[in-house]
Interface confidence: low
């Protein structure tokens, strides 16, 4: 004789105001002799939702016909759902019994939700910029959904993070319900071009996760490295002296040139460029006028960064007997 | 078990409409969305878009939009598939799929395939 | 677009051989690449999802591997009921996009 199984093939059951929701129920045996009733939650104050013998249920109507000799489906349809119908609906197998029939077996449950899409996953860095190998936090946030199983992953370039912490409110019933959740994540020099996804999967996305991203061009600081260099052809008179700035991010920099400590504040030319990492490159060139008479030189090439502290760079210059001493135009 | 079965085989002109319905049973329709799926003779599978069976909402894929509608009956737990004004290169198996509703959007439950055939 | 290119329309293997089919994505595609077999007058059957993972009741001769941009199905010991097409569809990003497609043929 095989034993008696009570298949409710569906954890959940996603419904919608109005509409009417069918809770499927099938046994795989006759055996024992006796009624399935349906119940809401479970324990000494469960609902009874339908009894096929007595009482009066107006809502609902069975999907076969219970009173045919060999039926084992006892799915159930209720009709105009309301939000007050959500919960954990049993089919429980009683035994005929006197005075009483005596409960048998019960399905694993259906659970009823009224189901609401989450909100645009919405990703926040960082207030203040940080540079690399240091650790930033980014938060991700998602409103207004039921039922309140969630899923939620991160991901930089498309690889999957694992140091997050989340948080799903309230812990009790809710008509809807909060996701918040923290990242953390270490820089990388090149991380200028890099993003990071929070995505959100949820029972009424059906396989479709939403979405939200943050640029980690907002959260890092990559500060430059400086060489001041001189050249060694001169321009009649003049030396041509470079200071390259390399590999910085953001855009915002200052650089001032300083001879034996004194600001100069004539014009010189510059070039920015932008390297494949999404990092700036500034070069900047200083002509310094060389004559007889002049005294030894030291430029000074000092950069501010992105409202950092500055940052320079000195270079003695060399001006040899031969350079003082040569006539001719020479190009650099 | 779960079970997707498409309607018959579909003879058209080109100019017509066709209809072709994909009927699910054994899981809980509104939880999970329908793909539909176009495999043209001698041609590999292309992915047509699919419809959100809990909100109705049907996305579809750039080469799709415009002749192509995806629908439901819900009652019915039934998703269609029309395409208007019927062209000789919709002559094809169109296969609808159920779309799981983890991370895992690869299709392990299929329809049987509707041919429609396009003669004048 | 994501494109998906599987470099070989045909392959003709013996029965009992060890057989790899080959996909490329056009673009990364971490590892969201499935496998699907196709047999004539039939709907097709989900093998691999996430480029290694064995779908439900699939026999373990079918093995999936790969990352990046390059996936790989093998078949370790293949048999006469194997001849049908392959698909590689990557679950990455939509539009969910399928490669041409591999014809396996028994000699």
């Known amino acids: 004789e095989e034993e008696l199984q009570m298949i409710q093939p569906e954890k959940l059951l996603l419904v919608t105001v109005g509409k009417t929701a069918t809770l499927h129920c099938t046994v795989t045996s006759l055996l024992p002799v006796g009624p399935v009733l349906w119940f809401r939650g479970v324990g000494p104050g469960r609902e009874l939702i339908y009894n096929q013998k007595e009482g009066h249920f107006p809502r609902v109507t069975t999907v076969s016909d219970l009173t045919k000799r060999n039926n084992m489906d006892f799915s159930i349809r209720i009709s105009s759902i309301t939000p007050a119908d959500v919960g954990t609906y049993y089919c429980v197998k009683f035994r005929k019994g006197s005075p009483e029939n005596v409960e048998f077996k019960s399905g694993p449950g259906t659970e009823m939700a009224l189901g609401a899409k989450p909100s645009a996953p919405v990703v926040l860095g960082p207030a203040a910029r940080t540079t690399p190998e240091h650790t930033v936090s980014f938060t991700c946030e998602s409103h207004g959904f039921s039922p309140r199983d969630i899923t939620l992953k991160w991901f930089k370039n498309g690889n999957e993070l694992s140091d997050f912490q989340t948080n799903v409110d309230p812990t009790g019933q809710s008509v809807a319900y909060s996701i918040r959740s923290t990242a953390r994540v270490v820089l990388d020099p090149w991380d200028v071009r890099s993003q990071v996804i929070c995505e959100v999967a949820h029972v009424t996305l059906q396989g479709d996760p939403l979405r939200g991203t943050a640029n980690l061009s907002e959260a890092i600081r990559v500060p430059p490295t400086l060489e001041v260099t001189q050249q060694p052809m001169r321009v009649g008179n003049q030396v041509n002296v470079t200071c390259q700035v390399r590999k910085f991010y953001p855009q915002s920099l200052q650089l001032t040139w300083s001879e034996n400590g004194n600001v100069c504040q004539r014009e010189t030319a510059s070039t920015l460029t932008e390297n494949k990492d999404g990092t700036y490159n500034w070069t900047s060139w200083f002509l310094v006028n060389i004559s007889d008479q002049r005294d030894d030189v030291v430029l000074t090439c000092q950069v501010k960064h992105d409202g950092q502290l500055a940052v320079s760079k000195r270079l003695a210059l060399e001006v040899t007997v031969h350079q003082k001493d040569q006539s001719s135009d020479a190009t650099p | 078990q779960i079970q997707l079965v498409q309607s018959g085989p579909e003879l058209k002109k080109p100019g017509e409409t066709v209809n072709i319905s994909c009927m699910a049973s054994?899981?809980?329709?509104?939880?999970?969305?329908m793909n539909w799926v176009k495999q043209a003779p001698g041609k590999g599978l292309k992915w047509m878009g699919w419809i959100n069976t809990y909100t109705g909402e049907p996305t579809y894929a750039d080469d799709f939009k415009g002749r192509f509608a995806f629908s439901l009956e819900t009652s019915a737990s039934t998703a269609y598939l029309q395409i208007n004004n019927l062209k000789n290169e919709d002559m094809a198996t169109y296969f609808c799929?159920?779309?799981?509703?983890?991370?895992?959007?690869?299709?392990?439950?299929w329809g049987q395939g509707t041919l429609v055939t396009v003669s004048a | 677009d994501i494109v998906m290119t599987q470099s070989h329309k045909f392959m003709s293997t013996s029965v009992g051989d060890r057989v790899n089919i080959t996909c490329k994505a056009s673009?990364?595609?971490?590892?969201?690449v499935a496998w699907y077999q196709l047999k004539p007058g039939q709907s097709p059957k989900l093998l691999i999802y996430w480029a290694s993972i064995r779908h439900t009741g699939v026999p373990d001769r079918f093995t999936g591997s790969g990352s990046g941009t390059d996936y790989t199905l093998t078949i370790s010991s293949v048999q006469a009921e194997h001849l049908a097409l392959y698909y590689c569809q990557q679950h990455y990003s939509t539009p969910w996009t399928f490669g041409g497609g591999t014809k396996l043929e028994i000699k």
């Open positions: 054994g899981y809980s329709f509104t939880n999970y969305g």
């Open positions: 799929a159920r779309q799981p509703y983890d991370y895992v959007p690869s299709f392990p439950y």
């Open positions: 673009q990364d595609v971490s590892t969201a």
